[in-house]
């Protein structure tokens, strides 16, 4: 069975998140899409989305955000640059399906931001999460205003969380420092 | 240690299927992606597309699109390449291969490779 | 798609010799950019990551530099072990591609 679960990503100020979203090619391809961040007890909010009906493979950048859906691949990247601690918060990755209520994606990213110095590109202590070039052509896209509430939930208390690191032989300070913490089965 | 175990070779005529399997073991199976990747005989590398067995979305390389299904059974942490509509210049080496980070990273270095599955194609 | 071009496609050298090898890609990639090693008969083994990263147990005369359209990839001092095919790959976008592929055999 399929599980909804939180990956947490811990960066730099002025590194860059860059993560992809899988969905259903068939169903979803020309869908709109879009990257929410969910605050405790609030409704998700729409931070950015890609245009309507979704071009392949098209930039679309919102202040700090740059959204990416691969048509062809089923995947939507998202990259958050120049990352501030206030970014820090639960993300998820939602299909607007009017007038349906949005559909979530997979797997939602727990990102924490903190002070210190990122290191500079090139670095072995840097990783792709420091790299970004602006694209090419980008578009600001409107976004729909509703958000469903049945995506609003809390992540499980840490206490009761499954916590798994990721495998001893990876090392994933040079990737990103990730942990998985499944939601619910 | 990571592991990935991939079915034996196969001999397949000219418009039949062929599909390798690749079991996992070491880690959590449905945690990261698993891709596909081929290389013909004195050839180069050539990727197909991916599967995430979490969520069982894949997608693949547009020439392999209409005939490349990706699947998993996550019960036994194995994926699967099915290739149909075989021609001769599939014949090659099909390698599964998993990715360094998990997921929903956008990092598509392939950090630990199947023993690679020879499928040869003739009549 | 993007289209990595190695050069060269095949290099003859000696144990204790630096090598170079390149890769160019036609367009800016920034960094998402892979190294590869394989030798005959074995799958394929993840040398350097994000162009420049050295990846766990790889030993350190491997080093990969660069950005944007042009990489390098070096072995410092060449081991009996190190001759195989090196490959480059991006990931700058989706397709993913590999450069042909490097040769390197012992002269």
């Known amino acids: 069975a399929t599980k909804l679960t939180e990956e947490k990503y811990e960066l730099k100020e002025g590194q860059t998140l860059d993560v992809k979203c899988d969905y259903t090619l068939e169903k979803f391809a020309s869908s709109q899409k879009a990257w929410q961040i969910i605050r405790d007890g609030e409704m998700p909010k729409t931070l950015a989305c890609t245009e309507r009906p979704s071009k392949n493979s098209h930039p679309v950048q919102v202040g700090r955000i740059i959204l990416e859906d691969y048509h062809d691949h089923g995947l939507l990247r998202v990259r958050m640059v120049n990352l501030q601690v206030e970014d820090s918060g639960l993300y998820q990755c939602v299909i607007y399906q009017p007038p349906k209520e949005p559909h979530m994606l997979f797997d939602r990213i727990r990102l924490v931001v903190t002070k210190g110095f990122s290191g500079t590109p090139g670095s072995n202590e840097n990783s792709t999460q420091n790299v970004y070039k602006i694209p090419p052509t980008t578009t600001k896209a409107l976004c729909p205003l509703y958000t469903s509430p049945r995506t609003v939930t809390q992540a499980p208390p840490k206490s009761t969380a499954d916590v798994s690191t990721p495998d001893s032989e990876i090392n994933l300070t040079n990737v990103t420092d990730i942990i998985r913490v499944p939601v619910f089965n | 240690q990571v592991q990935l175990v991939q079915s034996g070779a196969e001999v397949k005529k000219p418009g039949a299927s062929v599909k390798v399997s690749c079991k996992a073991s070491g880690y959590t199976f449905t945690s990261y992606d698993i891709n596909w990747v081929r290389q013909a005989t004195g050839q180069g590398l050539e990727w197909m597309g991916w599967?995430?067995?979490?969520?069982?979305?894949?997608g693949s390389v547009k020439k392999f699109r209409d005939r490349v299904t990706m699947t998993r059974d996550t019960s036994t942490s194995t994926a699967y390449m099915e290739l149909s509509s075989l021609r001769s210049e599939d014949t090659a080496v099909y390698y599964c291969?998993?990715?360094?980070?998990?997921?929903?990273?956008?990092?598509?270095?392939?950090?630990?490779w199947g023993q690679g599955t020879l499928v040869t194609v003739s009549s | 798609d993007i289209q990595m071009t190695q050069s060269p496609s095949s290099l003859s050298a000696s144990v204790g010799d630096r090598v170079t090898i390149t890769c160019q890609a036609s367009r800016d990639i920034s960094k998402y950019l892979n190294w590869y090693q394989q030798k005959p008969g074995k799958a394929p083994k993840l040398l350097i990551y994000d162009a420049s990263n050295l990846e766990t147990g790889v030993p350190s005369r491997f080093s990969g530099s660069g950005s944007g359209t042009d990489f390098t990839f070096t072995i410092s001092s060449l081991q009996p072990e190190d001759f195989a095919t090196y490959y480059c790959q991006h990931y700058d976008n989706i397709p993913i591609t590999f450069g042909q592929g490097t040769r390197l055999e012992i002269k």
């Open positions: 291969v998993r990715l360094i980070g998990y997921s929903s990273a956008y990092k598509w270095s392939f950090q630990h």
């Open positions: 599967m995430n067995p979490n969520s069982g979305n894949s």
